[in-house]
């Protein structure tokens, strides 16, 4: 996502509206403490990072907070005083929304409801992948509110599930990121399990009257 | 249906005010930014900035700084735009726009689906 | 600044006919382009955004293709109300505008 300007790669990651992360990757300044200037109006001075992300000892990143802010973030990464990358990104189109809350989990027969805490912020899919030993893939449904049913499950099979949100690319486009996903949870016959059986264990025999 | 509703032309002397509003109708006024744009007799469009109608928050684009504020009254949805200490350059259409997709909780981010239908600023002595 | 570049700076065509207006940015955009057409006396009004997604409303003539730095608007089958001038618009910043088309016909 960062064009190259002397060799500069530059990756921006917004955590849901209230972080911001800026790297670099600048294979001819590696061994240099490259530095990163910025500011969240076109006409103020710039600030300096203060909290830089290192690797290998050197300066790779930033993190801003910039909670709830609804602006262009301009930024100059340097080394010393002469500027090796200059830009100004809307921080909206690098988003990513964090992992859903407090999942819950209704089951109802051949049926369960998927429920989490929505986000203060809209425009969002709340997306729930499911699975039980016998599938090859993950199954998929998504909704713009975290409370989405999936029918026709069965109910004597052990169904894996997790959640996570993604912001809807006609509004915030291609380049946002998917929340990291929540924790896979285990359920059979509407009950938590542990895990689900690797292997699919054989459907017991009908017993007939 | 969403409406933007400018007010009327102006003729100003060198060195006066003005103040252009843009009441707004069809959605709820405090959901999304609305940008100050001009247009130059013969030419192209200028983005002047954008308030965030849930903040009130002013953001000014480079060359926009000083002279010009905004402002809102959100009790009417009505953004305005304020000019001091005119200049014959400032003879130029303004247009109001709402952001088309990105709330204010989250920002505005520059596409224009909603307009104004343009106020026309005169400066002449 | 990103800088906006379209051409040709106005063309004439004759209804029916295939016509192609071109942007180029001054630095890697993505898609985050918009086309606008405007008419004498009106307000712009959005065709295209994310480079090629139609808004609402806008006839399947219109069509947008491009990413990065080249981005290209065409109408398929030029018709006698598409008479206008048209912008391309960048929004990855703050947004700035190519300097217009204005498309008439022969």
């Known amino acids: 996502q960062g064009g190259a300007a002397e060799g500069v790669q530059i990756q921006i990651i917004y955590f849901n509206l209230e972080t911001v992360q800026v790297t670099w990757n600048a294979s001819k300044y590696s061994r240099t403490n490259l530095t990163f200037h910025y500011r969240f109006n076109g006409d103020e001075a710039y600030d300096q990072c203060t909290n830089y992300l290192l690797q290998e000892g050197h300066t790779s990143g930033c993190l801003l907070d910039a909670e709830q802010r609804d602006d262009i973030l301009y930024f100059s990464i340097r080394n010393g005083t002469h500027p090796v990358f200059t830009a100004s990104r809307w921080m909206v189109y690098y988003l990513k929304p964090s992992s859903p809350k407090h999942v819950r989990f209704s089951w109802h027969q051949d049926a369960v409801t998927v429920t989490c805490s929505d986000l203060s912020y809209g425009d969002l899919l709340y997306e729930v992948q499911y699975r039980s030993p016998f599938d090859t893939e993950w199954q998929s449904k998504q909704e713009n509110t975290c409370n989405v049913t999936i029918e026709g499950l069965d109910a004597e099979k052990c169904y894996s599930f997790w959640v996570r949100v993604k912001a809807m690319e006609d509004v915030y486009g291609p380049d946002t990121y998917p929340s990291d996903w929540s924790e896979v949870t285990c359920w059979q016959r509407g009950e938590i399990r542990d895990a689900c059986a690797e292997t699919p264990t054989p459907p017991k025999p009908k017993l007939s009257k | 249906q969403v409406q933007l509703v400018q007010s009327g032309a102006e003729v100003k002397k060198p060195g006066a005010s003005v103040k252009v509003s843009c009441k707004a109708s069809?959605?709820?006024?405090?959901?999304?930014?609305i940008s100050w744009l001009r247009q130059a007799p013969g030419q192209g469009l200028e983005w002047m900035g954008w308030?965030?109608?849930?903040?009130?928050?002013?953001r000014y684009a480079q060359g926009f700084t000083g002279r010009f504020v905004f402002s809102l009254d959100t009790s009417v949805s009505t953004a305005y735009l304020q000019i001091s200490s005119l200049k014959a350059e400032d003879t130029a259409v303004y247009y109001c726009?709402?952001?088309?997709?990105?709330?204010?909780?989250?920002?505005?981010?520059?596409?224009?689906?909603?307009w104004g239908q343009g106020t026309l600023v005169t400066v002449s002595s | 600044d990103i800088q906006m570049t379209q051409s040709p700076s106005s063309l004439s065509a004759s209804v029916g006919d295939r016509v192609t207006i071109t942007c180029r940015a001054s630095?890697?955009?993505?898609?985050?382009l918009a086309w606008y057409q405007q008419k004498p006396g009106q307000p712009p009004k959005l065709l295209i955004y994310?480079?090629?997604t139609r808004a609402s409303g806008v006839p399947d003539r219109f069509s947008g293709t491009g990413s990065g730095t080249d981005f290209t608007l065409t109408i398929s089958s030029l018709q006698a109300e598409d008479v206008a001038v048209y912008y391309c618009?960048?929004?990855?910043?703050?947004?700035?505008f190519g300097q217009g088309t204005k498309l008439e016909i022969k």
């Open positions: 994310w480079a090629s």
């Open positions: 630095q890697d955009i993505h898609t985050r």
């Open positions: 618009q960048q929004y990855s910043t703050y947004p700035t």
């Open positions: 069809g959605y709820t006024f405090t959901t999304y930014g």
């Open positions: 726009a709402r952001e088309g997709f990105i709330t204010t909780v989250v920002g505005a981010a520059g596409r224009f689906v909603y």
């Open positions: 308030v965030n109608t849930n903040t009130g928050n002013p």
